[in-house]
Amino acid sequence: WPPPGTGDIIVQAPTQVPGFLGDSVTLPCYLQVPGMEETHVSQLTWSRHGESGSMAVFHQTQGPNYSEPKRLEFVAARLGTELRDASLRMFGLRVEDEGNYTCLFVTFPQGSRSVDIWLRVLAKPQNTAEVQKVQLTGKPVPVARCVSTGGRPPAHITWHSDLGGMPNTSQAPGFLSGTVTVTSLWILVPSSQVDGKSVTCKVEHESFEKPQLLTVNLTVYYPPEVSISGYDNNWYLSQNEATLTCDARSNPEPTGYNWSTTMGPLPPFAVAQGAQLLIRPVDKPINTTFICNVTNALGARQAELTVQVKEGPPSEPSGMSSN
């Protein structure tokens, strides 16, 4: 607001006032009169730029007169009082109320004094973020969706991600006239490494005290990625039993594990227990390639591992190392 004047009277008002769609808002406007200065206010007038006539007038003798009596009201001006406060309340804010308004004091003998105020009509958006569940497409697809509904002005959406990718943002009219719904998609090439990771949608709007952060946990559906662990290339005869583990990553979770060998069914010393294969002690050297086949809703994948059980040197007491 302007600093107090030393001699002249000054109309004080903010340059911009925000109000929310459907709510009421007060356009503040005051006449500041220096200490010794005498002034007489005979009329307060509010008008809108680009429109002829006044929307609200308060006359020293006739009181208030409004272009829309149900929507306008002088907050403090009263008959029989010094007219120093021209603040005007507007009810049921509409989009078309946004614009420049002039508050004018008719004073004597100083003359007319006015100030312009920009009324911003805002609508606070509702924000949601959701995952877009995808499969391994091999090409960029939306993996997350962030929607800011019914904002005025449109919300600003940005994404934060360590996974790479790029946004695709679009706007559409909101449910209420003059509002905008902003939809932003986070697009990347899906991979199993992306599954379970998160991206953050940041929504900024002048009605917010601070940006809203919405985190989305990504879902990528992919067939099993399989490996077999538990063998260290140092298995010998007369050892304790050992275990091979079929390590499978998949989404959705594996529905079944099937163990076999390249020669067909499992030999007697190998016992399947779900994702694990129990290898019992053997009394003669073997050289067998085990196969673990993992199934989920998207398909089956397998891994192979060749296991050798060797004749160990007598000096080594250790048996088949189990993991």
């Epitope: 030393t6 010794m36 200065e37 005979s42 020293q60």
Partner: antibody, heavy 121, light 110 residues
Framework: QVQMQQSGAELVKPGASVKLSCKTS????????ISWLKQKPGQSLEWIAW????????NYNQKFTGKAQVTVDTSSSTAYMQFSSLTTEDSAIYYC??????????????WGAGTTVTVSS | QAVVTQESALTTSPGETVTLTCRSS?????????ANWVQEKPDHLFTGLIG???NRAPGVPARFSGSLIGDKAALTITGAQTEDEAIYFC?????????FGGGTKLTVLG
């Protein structure tokens, strides 16, 4: 046609009072500011007071506080100034003036012809 | 109370530009003094010319203009005419009252 019709000349004795009138026409009286001015023969003008006709709100030159009282009668669109405890120093022409607005500022717009007051024993 | 001083008399010729000034005893005249200029012709015929320092009254010829020049209020007549011969008073506002100057008698030699 805008007019400010002032009452006729007054010859009064020292110590007496006089009430001058200024009948207006041709404009909205209730939203008018009217000033009263004094001019002694061959001299400058002296501002006495203004009154806002709509409410009767007034503002006086401190020099004339207690000496002059300005009032209005909205029903007849007439402004009055009563001068009391008259002395020979009060002998002068008294003008009523309606202020006009240029929008940004006010000016001394419409002048009455003046009322001559002579104070003499 | 403040004293407002004007040139007592000025002379000009038709078509010439003449400037009348108005000085305040309290210091520089500012826009907060809302300078007024009034013309008086014989038989006490008064006309308000300027209000609020530089706002010309409706119907007043454009050759009359008000301004601040230095620390004084000024009335400039650009291209004076013989009918402009008159007494010109300035009035300044001092927070709660007007004070008139002594007036300038302008003669337009024709």
């Amino acid at each position: 046609q805008v007019q400010m019709q002032q009452s006729g000349a007054e010859l009064v004795k020292p110590g007496a009072s006089v009430k001058l009138s200024c009948k207006t026409s041709g404009f909205t009286f209730s939203s008018s500011y009217i000033s009263w001015l004094k001019q002694k023969p061959g001299q400058s003008l002296e501002w006495i007071a203004w009154i806002y006709a709509g409410t009767g709100d007034t503002n006086y030159n401190q020099k004339f506080t207690g000496k002059a009282q300005v009032t209005v009668d909205t029903s007849s669109s007439t402004a009055y100034m009563q001068f009391s405890s008259l002395t020979t120093e009060d002998s002068a022409i008294y003008y009523c003036v309606r202020h006009g607005s240029t929008g940004r500022g006010w000016y001394f717009a419409v002048w009455g012809a003046g009322t001559t007051v002579t104070v003499s024993s | 109370q403040a004293v407002v001083t004007q040139e007592s008399a000025l002379t000009t010729s038709p078509g010439e530009t003449v400037t009348l000034t108005c000085r305040s005893s309290t210091g520089a005249v500012t826009t907060s003094n809302y300078a007024n200029w009034v013309q008086e012709k014989p038989d006490h015929l008064f006309t308000g010319l300027i209000g609020g320092t530089n706002n010309r009254a409706p119907g007043v010829p454009a050759r009359f203009s008000g301004s601040l020049i230095g620390d004084k209020a000024a009335l400039t007549i650009t291209g004076a005419q013989t009918e402009d011969e008159a007494i010109y008073f300035c009035a300044l506002w001092y927070s709660n009252h007007f004070v008139f100057g002594g007036g300038t008698k302008l003669t337009v030699l024709g």
